[in-house]
Amino acid sequence: SPYSSDTTPCCFAYIARPLPRAHIKEYFYTSGKCSNPAVVFVTRKNRQVCANPEKKWVREYINSLEMS
């Protein structure tokens, strides 16, 4: 999960494995102030998961979320 510092969520580790696409309802990018660029996926249970924006599955999920 992203770590909040002064209300700016940042990620210090990424999930390596793909999450089920059907479990993800939205996403957001962390702030440019964070040391690690990250995508945060929000699951249908409102859990937040940090992911590496360079990973293929992450890019694929972002594209499909943008289209839906």
């Epitope: 999930i15 494995r17 999450l19 479990h23 990973k55």
Partner: antibody, heavy 119, light 108 residues
């Protein structure tokens, strides 16, 4: 060192159920995603389903939906896979395998449990 | 659902290079993992994310992924490399892990 140790071989009659266990040592079960994969004699690997800790949910391969149940007992760090309404085509070696936080991919695997379905 | 196609068998002489292919529609858009399975044993991950090796896997094992084909390359093949090899991808359309049919590598 992470290790997975599975329960012993089973012989079942058609229509019965089987429950295979997978005991984890070297880490706590809820740190990792646990998956189940089977391999029929002389055939390839077939993914059956797995637990997604990030969402606290289990996903099943469509082929096994309604016939398989995967559970975890975190107090004993043991995962279970139960397959019901067995038929002869379910004769296979059943493996548990973890999907760690890093690197991606299934590793390590249990030693496998042979399930034979025969009348 | 997503289909991965592997040749059933590949034969190679010791010291030579074995190339095992895994075909799938636009597979380059997916991360491919490769497993080695020796007779009577559980599979072992040898390559993940197309081309990365887990610790303990020899540098002789390498992977690539382009277009509709991913490839596992075993250079300077040894007798101990004789095994079945499986490719695997995550299919986000079905939320399923998918395995190829496997390739038996025989060292002549």
């Amino acid at each position: 060192q992470v290790q997975l140790v599975q329960s012993g071989a089973e012989v079942k009659k058609p229509g019965a159920s089987v429950k295979v266990s997978c005991k984890v040592s070297g880490y706590t079960l809820n740190d990792f995603a646990m998956h189940w994969v089977r391999q029929a004699p002389g055939k390839g690997l077939e993914w059956m389903g797995g637990y997604v800790p990030e969402d606290g949910d289990t996903i099943y391969a469509q082929k096994f939906q309604g016939r398989v149940t995967m559970t975890e007992d975190t107090s004993t760090d043991t995962a279970y896979m139960e397959l019901s309404s067995l038929r002869s085509e379910d004769t296979a070696v059943y493996y548990c395998a973890t999907d760690p936080l890093y690197p991606p991919g299934l590793q390590p695997w249990g030693q496998g449990t042979t399930v034979t379905v025969s009348s | 659902s997503y289909v991965l196609t592997q040749p059933p068998s590949v034969s190679v002489a010791p010291g030579q290079t074995a190339r095992i292919t895994c075909g799938g529609n636009n597979i380059e858009s997916k991360s491919v993992h490769w497993y080695q399975q020796k007779p009577g044993q559980a599979p072992v991950l040898v390559v993940y994310d197309d081309s990365d090796r887990p610790s303990g896997i020899p540098e002789r094992f390498s992977g690539s992924n382009s277009g509709n084909t991913a490839t596992l390359t075993i250079s300077r093949v040894e007798a101990g490399d004789e095994a079945d090899y499986y490719c695997q991808v995550w299919d986000s359309n079905t939320d399923h892990w998918v395995f190829g049919g496997g390739t038996k590598v025989t060292v002549l």
